[in-house]
Interface confidence: low
């Protein structure tokens, strides 16, 4: 199929980073300059993705692929290949339309993104608080109160929190 | 690593013609643009043309059409430039250069061309 | 042909110093100007790319703004290792065209 399909239609053999150019007889040109062709066989060339203003570049276009963008230092991408830029707040914060917010008592937000989420409750799981919550972090659950009855082994130490800038994306 | 290594300085006689060299190494020879570069002593940068060594594919400024020709060796992954009808004015240092889409990228180290009688 | 006019045509800074230079272009050009490095006895090196794009391992005290006709390279706080020349050129259709140069001298 691909062999008779090539002999059909000459642009099937134009590269990707080439497209296929009709108005000089098919011949497969290079895509001029800012774009690109990521596939064999195009009759276009795309143009290049801009990175500007908030957005920051990645990855620079090539003659067979798009730019990728990123954000700048203080924004977060959101949405499928970074279409937007988000603010970035505080850990211990979430951002609402009037800006960066503080966690409401009784919830927390560990990133720089996301919202505030209720601090886990213990006693569902028949535990007890080990470690209070902040803004920034989960409370701690430690055994229940009927474990620490004399003679019990000793708690282990919660794992250290991590280290801010540090939580994932 | 991308290199682009030039040929070395050419000493050419007024009316004669020149061909250097850009061997490329280092990324795909045949799906990038090769630019070449020309500046005289002293002064900026001058486009001279570009190639697409995957289909010898070239377009030229018009100011050197008819005085540069650009060809390229997928093969041996190098590209070539040929001066002909040369004068003093051709006196310079020439450049290949791998273009990303938006810029020359990278840069070979030159060729100095001395026309001289 | 584009016309990429750089100014000023020298300049002589001291360590820590500011430098701006400027490049204009004769006609919308959008992003597409790069700007490079140049020092004595070498081939020209790509700094900015798209405008405002740091190339890779270029350091941050050199910082490229504007677009359409106007564009500017800044050197936050200049070193004796800057001194060269500095060329702006468009990448926006062909013929690509430079500027002239702008040579930075280091008090």
């Known amino acids: 199929f691909e062999r008779t399909r090539s002999l059909q239609d000459p642009c099937s053999n134009c590269p990707a980073g080439t497209f296929c150019d009709n108005n000089r007889n098919q011949i497969c040109s290079p895509c001029p300059p800012n774009s690109f062709s990521s596939a064999g066989g195009q009759r276009t060339c795309d143009i290049c993705r801009q990175c500007k203003g908030v957005f920051r570049t990645r990855k620079e276009c090539s003659s067979t692929s798009n730019a990728e963008c990123d954000c700048t230092p203080g924004f977060h991408c959101l949405g499928a290949g970074c279409s937007m830029c988000e603010q970035d707040c505080k850990q211990g914060q979430e951002l609402t339309k009037k800006g960066c917010k503080d966690c409401c008592f009784g919830t927390f937000n560990d990133q720089k993104r996301g919202i505030c989420r209720p601090w886990t409750n213990c006693s569902l799981d028949g535990k007890s608080v080990l470690v209070n919550g902040t803004k920034e972090r989960d409370v701690v659950c430690g055994p229940s109160p009927a474990d620490l009855s004399p003679g019990a082994s000793s708690v282990t130490p919660p794992a250290p929190a991590r280290e801010p800038g540090h939580s994932p994306q | 690593e991308v290199q682009l290594q030039q040929s070395g300085t050419v000493l050419a006689r007024p009316g004669a013609s020149v061909k250097m060299s850009c061997k490329a190494s280092?990324?795909?020879?045949?799906?990038?643009?090769m630019h070449w570069v020309k500046q005289r002593p002293g002064q900026g940068l001058e486009w001279i043309g570009v190639i697409y060594p995957g289909n010898s594919d070239t377009s030229y400024n018009q100011k050197f059409k008819g005085k540069a020709k650009l060809t390229a060796v997928t093969s041996a992954s190098t590209a070539y430039m040929e001066l002909s009808s040369l004068t003093n004015e051709d006196s310079a240092v020439y450049y290949c250069?791998?273009?990303?889409?938006?810029?020359?990228?990278?840069w070979g180290q030159g060729t100095t061309l001395t026309v001289s009688s | 042909n584009i016309v990429m006019t750089q100014s000023p045509k020298s300049m002589s800074m001291s360590v820590g110093e500011r430098v701006t230079l400027s490049c204009k272009a004769s006609e919308n050009v959008g992003i597409y100007v790069s700007w490079y490095q140049q020092k004595p006895e070498q081939s020209p090196k790509l700094l900015i790319y798209?405008?405002?794009n740091r190339y890779t391992g270029v350091p941050d005290r050199f910082t490229g703004s504007g677009s359409a006709t106007d564009f500017t390279l800044t050197i936050s706080s200049v070193q004796p290792e800057d001194l060269a020349d500095y060329h702006c050129g468009h990448t926006y259709n062909y013929p690509f065209t430079f500027g002239s140069g702008t040579k930075l001298e280091i008090k």
């Open positions: 280092g990324y795909s020879f045949t799906s990038n643009w």
């Open positions: 798209g405008a405002s």
């Open positions: 250069t791998r273009g990303i889409t938006t810029a020359p990228e990278y």
